[in-house]
Amino acid sequence: TQHGIRLPLRSGLGGAPLGLRLPRETDEEPEEPGRRGSFVEMVDNLRGKSGQGYYVEMTVGSPPQTLNILVDTGSSNFAVGAAPHPFLHRYYQRQLSSTYRDLRKGVYVPYTQGKWEGELGTDLVSIPHGPNVTVRANIAAITESDKFFINGSNWEGILGLAYAEIARPDDSLEPFFDSLVKQTHVPNLFSLQLCGAGFPLNQSEVLASVGGSMIIGGIDHSLYTGSLWYTPIRREWYYEVIIVRVEINGQDLKMDCKEYNYDKSIVDSGTTNLRLPKKVFEAAVKSIKAASSTEKFPDGFWLGEQLVCWQAGTTPWNIFPVISLYLMGEVTNQSFRITILPQQYLRPVEDVATSQDDCYKFAISQSSTGTVMGAVIMEGFYVVFDRARKRIGFAVSACHVHDEFRTAAVEGPFVTLDMEDCGYNIPQTDESTLMT
């Protein structure tokens, strides 16, 4: 999980105001054991701010200390600020918790830019707008950090929802979700609906806004339209998947599919952008530039550095292409595609926009660590992390931002041969993953 390159992401207002809420289709999947179709208490339990993270309210310790915690499917530690920091309004005070237990072990997590370090312990944890359970979980109490916390983001910690293999300091440190499932009757599954604003929000709007839903232990059918399509989790470390084809406005990028997954492809709620391997990024940008050639933008825009601004309400969405990622299906030789709109990959930037302007950053960027399907992808979809069945489901989100001409889509099946060949096998070495 990277901060800096891997900034946590954007949220916004959930539900109808964000654009058209699509009508629900009636052909639902059959119910599965332990999965109710409605989780009212968990709907709209996420908030956040553009480019800075979706967070959920959690309580830690006895008596409970309330903290906002970034929801991150790209890491596996539950880590919270535990010392004063200029960007933190509050922090975990272990000395005030009667149930805190010190593990007498430190943890140090460096990123490409920045780091955090802390002390490991366990304490009682619950999620007020989640399942009605309390679990004893490992907690990294962050005592020192650099470029980790974000000024004004309103979160004080991070909930790593990926697997133990990438936990720090090592895979013996049980992640929160594993503890939750072991200690309770909560099914081994969670789902995320991240609702991008689609337009810039000022500070007061953000603080009062809703950013989406994390449904712990199930699937809420009100949060998506159409059918859920599942792709296998290739390996349980990150939420690794396999992309088998990429299209820009229906035009195949025509690359060896291994390139799309070099050196992996992951679904990561803690990354803002859709990040693509260098060769894939270059080909995709070339294709997007060609598709949107009626207007020309500076090089810095395509690098995600410069903003492009249009007079309020005049953003020419129609000149930008849709992007489709084909994912390996559950059935041999079958794939499905997820399609996002420019409303997902052009990220509104609220600091600069005025009442006269709507300003956007290009939220597709280059990666040296494989494809990262961050908020740009996830904001189009309801994403089900079905750990029990080692698969990830995608359906069109009921809150995704679109216009009257195009919507995000999840469609299939498509016949795709030799999909296994699309996966990249990372050479097994003693190399640490600490700098991912």
């Epitope: 020309k296 500076p298 090089d299 810095g300 410069q306 492009v308």
Partner: antibody, heavy 120, light 108 residues
């Protein structure tokens, strides 16, 4: 080397349309690396960006002037033009044409400028 | 909209002296800032781009620094031809429409 030269009437009556042309010499206006823009400077004041155009015809305008401005390009003549309608005395200024890079997005080359006075 | 504020409005110095001009942005513009020089009766000329890179043909006595919101143009030793008005411009947002109000460097 590439040069820009503005031309057009130096005096325009209030409520009429100001029309200026910028001729590009020593290079092609059809370069894929540049936009071509207009900036003005009222006497004794600062610089105000008016708008710009790409050789394909794609335009960007200053919102405060958008309702009155039209910028067009004639690649066959290697020229681009500015029309500003319903002028008032506040539009009296030196009008500059300039080149804007897409790689380095600054005004890296300017014409000498032409003074346009709005007066009856 | 990002506002650029230049200071001082006027700088009175003698040839050979060091000139330090400031440009402050109302919000971060990263390093997407340029400096232009304008002499009386002439068009502006690009001096510095991307906050610190000298444009072609610009003497080494001109240097730019800063990033985010605070930028500085320094003329290490003023030559007679350097007395002019200097403008900053941000292109963090496209289209590139925002200029500062200018600083006049005059002979003391």
């Amino acid at each position: 080397q590439l040069q820009l030269q503005e031309s057009g009437p130096g005096l325009v009556k209030p409520s009429e349309t100001l029309s200026l042309t910028c001729t590009v010499s020593g290079g092609s206006i059809s370069s894929s690396s540049y936009y071509w823009g207009w900036i003005r400077q009222p006497p004794g004041k600062g610089l105000e960006w008016i708008g710009m155009i790409y050789y394909s015809g794609s335009t960007w305008y200053n919102p405060s002037l958008k309702s009155r401005v039209t910028i067009s390009v004639d690649t066959s003549k290697n020229q681009f033009s500015l029309k500003l309608s319903s002028v008032t005395a506040a539009d009296t200024a030196v009008y500059y044409c300039a080149r804007v890079g897409l790689g380095v997005s600054y005004f890296d080359l300017w014409g000498r400028g032409t003074l346009v006075t709005v007066s009856s | 909209e990002i506002v650029l504020t230049q200071s001082p409005a006027t700088l009175s110095l003698s040839p050979g002296e060091r000139a330090t001009l400031s440009c402050r942005a109302s919000q971060s513009v990263s390093s997407y800032l340029a400096w232009y020089q304008q002499k009386p009766g002439q068009a502006p000329r690009l001096l510095i781009y991307d906050a610190s890179k000298r444009a072609t043909g610009i003497p080494a006595r001109f240097s730019g620094s800063g990033s985010g919101t605070d930028f500085t143009l320094t003329i290490s030793s003023l030559e007679p031809e350097d007395f002019a008005v200097y403008y900053c411009q941000q292109v963090y947002t496209w289209p590139p429409r925002t200029f500062g109000g200018g600083t006049k460097v005059e002979i003391k």
